[in-house]
Each structure stands twice: as C-alpha cells, then as structure tokens.
Interface confidence: low
Amino acid sequence: CGQMQEELDLTISAETRKQTACKPEIAYAYKVSITSITVENVFVKYKATLLDIYKTGEAVAEKDSEITFIKKVTCTNAELVKGRQYLIMGKEALQIKYNFSFRYIYPLDSLTWIEYWPRDTTCSSCQAFLANLDEFAEDIFLNGC
C-alpha cells in the first residue's frame, strides 16, 4: 500500500521530498490530478492527468497525458480523491500490452509516496505548504537528482 503523507504537513521539507524522489528505487515523481476511480475485482484503478514530471523512469509518460494508478482494495490508508491533486513518487510502472502499443500502470505499493497537493492558496497554512512543495518542484526540476 502507498505511503499517504499527512495533509498539509509543514514539517516535511523540500529536501526530504527530494531525497525520496532521488532514491534509486524511485523511478518517477509526478504531480497528478485524479480524474476517475473504478473498482475492478480486488483492485482500485485511478485515472489521472499528468500535470508535471519531476523524474521519470523507463515509462516515459507525457505531460498532460492520462496515466493509471492501481492499488489493492484492502489498501485503505491510501485513498485518492477524484478532483484532487497529488505528488506521487514510486517505483517503475508495469508495462501492459494494449492493442499494438504499451500502456503503463503505476502500482501504489509500500514504496509509493503520496501527498495531497492543494489548489487552494487562500489559507495561510496552504500557502506555506505550497511554498515547500514549490521549492521541491523547482529544485528537482531545475537541478535534477
């Protein structure tokens, strides 16, 4: 199950996020917006729009494209909400053959970092939290690992 971080946790520094993103076992770091949620047997599928790419692995998804995250139904600690934005960092995607091309599915497993990325900048705590997220995004985007 994914590691859902506490919402608006100001104790998480930009450096902590960068250290996580730059771990060798972490293949990607994305900012995403959840567009739909479907339950299929023992799995929950989240379709998401890829808003920003900070790190990418073998599965080279494109900005603004649709990607899929998958988790076990039993993973109740990592409930993503439709319409919300998240910073998600995790291991390499699973490559699924689809027609004559490949699709990538990102498993939300124990290695996955999931953090709510608020859109609202009006509350002071949101602003300070967004500043930390922006600092992480800027650093990894501009400097890399």
């Epitope: 520094s13 930009a14 450096e15 602003q127 300070a128 500043a131 600092e135």
Partner: antibody, heavy 118, light 109 residues
Framework: EVQLVESGGGLVQPGGSLILSCAAS????????MTWVRQAPGKGLEWVCA???????YYADSVKGRFTCSRDNSKNTLYLQMNSLRAEDTAVYYC????????????WGAGTTVTVSS | DVVLTQSPLSLAVLLGQPASISCRAS???????LAWYQQRPGQSPRLLIY???SRATGVPDRFSGSGSGTDFTLKISRVEAEDVGVYFC??????????FGGGTKLEIK
Amino acid sequence: EVQLVESGGGLVQPGGSLILSCAASGFTFSSYAMTWVRQAPGKGLEWVCAISGSGSTYYADSVKGRFTCSRDNSKNTLYLQMNSLRAEDTAVYYCARRGLRYNYFDYWGAGTTVTVSS
Amino acid sequence: DVVLTQSPLSLAVLLGQPASISCRASQSVSSSYLAWYQQRPGQSPRLLIYGASSRATGVPDRFSGSGSGTDFTLKISRVEAEDVGVYFCQQYGRSLEYTFGGGTKLEIK
C-alpha cells in the same frame, strides 16, 4: 506587515570583507526563499544570490566563490558574507523576499550601501 | 544565460497619456517566470506584475502586463505623476539564475 531591514554596509578596501544582515518580520521567514540583489550607482539591478527556506543556495557567476548567502531561521535573519571585495562590488545591496510562487521578489528592503575603495 | 533587452531606454509622457515598455528576451521565457518592477527615485524596487500579466497586491489597474515567448510588454493606460521612475523586467531561468532588463526611465513631459 512584511518588513525587511538591511544593515552592515560601509566603506571597505579592495580585497576586504563585509557581512550584511537583513532582519525580516511580519511573515513566516522559514517558509520563504530569500535573495540579495544589488544596484551599482546609476545602474540597473543585478541578482546576487538566493537561499531556499531550508538553506539551499544559488549564486550569480560574478560572486561565486567570494560571497556566501546564509540564513538563521530562528533569528529571522538573512546574511551575505562578502570576501575578496572588488571595486565593481560597490552598490546598494537589497534583500528581497521571493514570492511563494518562486519566480518574483514581492517585498524589498530599503537597501544598504557598500563602497569598495582604497 | 537569458539576456533581457528593454526599450526604449527612456520615455517622456504627458500626464494622462498611455505608456508602453518592451522587454525582449534572447531566448524563450516561460510566462510564469516574467515579472516587472517599478523603482521610484530614491526608493527600492516594487513588484508590479508577475507571471507576465498578474498584478501584484495594491498595484493600480492602470498597469498591465502581456506577452509570451520572447516578447513582453508593460503598459500604463494613463500615466500619473507618481509613476515617474525606472521600470525593470526580470526573468527566472532554468539554470537557477534571475536576470533583469537594463531598465526604462519614465519621465513626465
């Protein structure tokens, strides 16, 4: 009310050193990246350095290796250690707060003047 | 590094008349990373516009910013006496450097 007050400027000989301070108030200092910008007499603005809330630093090529940008979040203070000063470092030095959206400077201090001359 | 070239270097405008300042970048700049500042005589710079077109808090609506790519413009719809000073554009680049334009001096005719 956001306030930035620089101090520490003065006259220094070429090759000398100086430490500038910027006392910040009216906002959560540790949440913001801070910068130093200078303005030579009658000239335009030149970015000197930036420091993130957690202490990552970035420098203009013209000062790299000579200037050190630092901060003490417990004291709400930004510092600029200037070594090996040259005549071309003569300027008004402003400290500025970087906006939460990280590409602009939304508040500036009144500046402190550094004169490098023999 | 990106070089920002402002034009004109100076302009004199009648009170109540419009003014326009251009900022041209040597290579494409993200609109999110372009800002404008005003520096009145004897004062420190003040943020006017960020993100190429968003007015900073407390900035009168006679100031507007526009542009994308390499060409950006600051417009003052009706110049007032308090608008006298030097105007600077500024960008933030991917190599973590902040660059300012050379400045445009605005005077009242």
